[in-house]
């Protein structure tokens, strides 16, 4: 670092402002130094002496240049349905985000205050809109010709298999059952899974949209923590 030149508070030009990382102290009527992140003002400046800064205590922080008399307290420890994505340090608050399979029902400035488990669509219903970090799964009834036989927060409605001869017709919660001759499918067999939302601040999954339903067959369920609605399970 270059040779230190001690800062002396100064009166700003008439109509002027203090420099960046300085503040105007109303009592001293001078431009004085702000304290850097991780520190706070221990002693405020006077006309002849600059701000005296001190490090933040454990479990407290300041994220910005400041002249606060006390550092801010870090948030409480993350709850069991959350993961700590940023630890509490002298320069940053703890950040808690929801773990996989959960979404943030009540967010705060950074991270999440309250997590809720993602809704599971019951048999006969598939995922119309997948869950994200901040929104719940939306279920829809399976349209004619499609079914879902699972209780899942990721499975969409799949087409019935097409039989040469149908033994048991399919319905919204069950695939068609064919006689012994081999069936064909309008789509590849096997459940289609939508990705779980990623519980980090930097990644956002872009799941592929579910196949559109017949007109008038989709409906939306309320987003956010709510009693189990039709088509969803409350576990």
């Amino acid at each position: 670092l270059p040779a230190q030149v001690a800062f002396t508070p100064y009166a700003p030009e008439p109509g002027g402002t203090c420099r960046l990382r300085e503040y105007y102290d109303q009592t001293a009527q001078m431009c004085c130094s702000k304290c850097p992140p991780g520190q706070h003002a221990k002693v405020f400046c006077t006309k002849t002496s600059d701000t005296v800064c001190d490090s933040c205590e454990d479990s407290t922080y300041t994220q910005l240049w400041n002249w606060v008399p006390e550092c801010l307290s870090c948030g409480s420890r993350c709850s069991s349905d959350q993961v700590e994505t940023q630890a509490c340090t002298r320069e940053q608050n703890r950040i808690c985000t929801c773990r996989p399979g959960w979404y943030c029902a009540l967010s705060k400035q950074e991270g999440c205050r309250l997590c809720a488990q993602l809704r599971k669509c019951r048999p006969g219903f598939g995922v119309a809109r997948p869950g994200t970090e901040t929104s719940d799964v939306v279920c829809k009834p399976c349209a004619p010709g499609t079914f879902s036989n699972t209780t899942s927060s990721t499975d969409i409605c799949r087409p019935h298999q097409i039989c040469h001869v149908v033994a048991i017709p399919g319905n919204a919660s069950m695939d068609a059952v064919c006689t012994s001759t081999s069936p064909t499918r309008s789509m590849a067999p096997g459940a289609v899974h939508l990705p779980q939302p990623v519980s980090t601040r930097s990644q956002h999954t872009q799941p592929t949209p579910a196949p559109s339903t017949a007109p008038g067959t989709s409906f939306l369920l309320p987003v956010g923590p709510s009693p189990p609605a039709e088509g969803s399970t409350g576990d």
Partner: antibody
Framework: QVQLQQSGAEVVRPGASVTLSCKAS????????MHWVKQTPVHGLEWIGA????????AYNQKFKDKARVTADKSSSTAYMELRSLTSEDSAVYYC????????????????WGQGTTLTVSS | DIVMTQSQKFMSTSVGDRVSVTCKAS??????VAWYQQKPGQSPKVMIY???YRYSGAPDRFTGSGSGTDFTLTVNNVQSEDLAEYFC?????????FGGGTKLEIE
């Protein structure tokens, strides 16, 4: 090593706006203020304004308050300056420069400069 | 605004000579003054800060002096690579202001 890489020369029409960029590397971008300076043969070096990338706080020379707007993007370590309502008077070389200014010191000199962006305003 | 005046626009000197560039502030700026060297087609480079502290990258033939309103940049044993324009700058208060520059010409 510290480098400030500025965007290329611009030729623009009067009345238009332009945004110049300054990408920083070799140091922690948010630790230092970024300042912008204009240079012309007639007026020499003129301080336009500055930004603290950590907070987004800005300061301007009154002369350029309605002309320039400085911003910074911490994620890409890039500072920007938008110049509005351009006239031939705005034709100049514009520099971004890092300020050494730090707590407890009156030091505030410019230790690293970009290579400059030449702006020509012409119809 | 604080006006920084460099009264000499050009100064002529010879290799090996000593030359002094002056700068006057319109009001007291303490020692909050820096000197920059700018060679043709290049960006400015800091040579002196806080009126008298030599920047780490500057040759030791460059010295600065002064406080309050009168400042001097002295180049001892001038070299051909010192051919450049020199600017003073005050950083006491916003808006930061520069002198008009003094071009050093080598005879």
């Amino acid at each position: 090593q510290v480098q400030l890489q500025q965007s290329g020369a611009e030729v623009v029409r009067p009345g238009a706006s332009v945004t110049l960029s300054c990408k920083a590397s070799g140091y922690t971008f948010s630790d230092y203020e970024m300042h912008w300076v204009k240079q012309t043969p007639v007026h020499g070096l003129e301080w336009i304004g500055a930004i603290d990338p950590e907070t987004g706080d800005t300061a301007y020379n009154q002369k350029f308050k309605d002309k320039a707007r400085v911003t910074a993007d911490k994620s890409s370590s890039t500072a920007y300056m938008e110049l509005r309502s351009l006239t031939s008077e705005d034709s100049a070389v514009y520099y971004c420069t890092r300020d050494i200014h730090y707590y407890g010191s009156s030091l505030s000199y410019f230790d690293y400069w970009g290579q400059g962006t030449t702006l020509t305003v012409s119809s | 605004d604080i006006v920084m005046t460099q009264s000499q626009k050009f100064m002529s000197t010879s290799v090996g000579d000593r030359v002094s560039v002056t700068c006057k502030a319109s009001q007291n700026v303490g020692t909050n003054v820096a000197w920059y060297q700018q060679k043709p087609g290049q960006s400015p480079k800091v040579m002196i800060y806080s009126a008298s502290y030599r920047y780490s990258g500057a040759p030791d033939r460059f010295t600065g002096s002064g406080s309050g309103t009168d400042f001097t940049l002295t180049v001892n044993n001038v070299q051909s690579e010192d051919l450049a324009e020199y600017f003073c700058q005050q950083y006491k208060t916003y808006p930061y202001t520069f002198g008009g520059g003094t071009k050093l010409e080598i005879e």
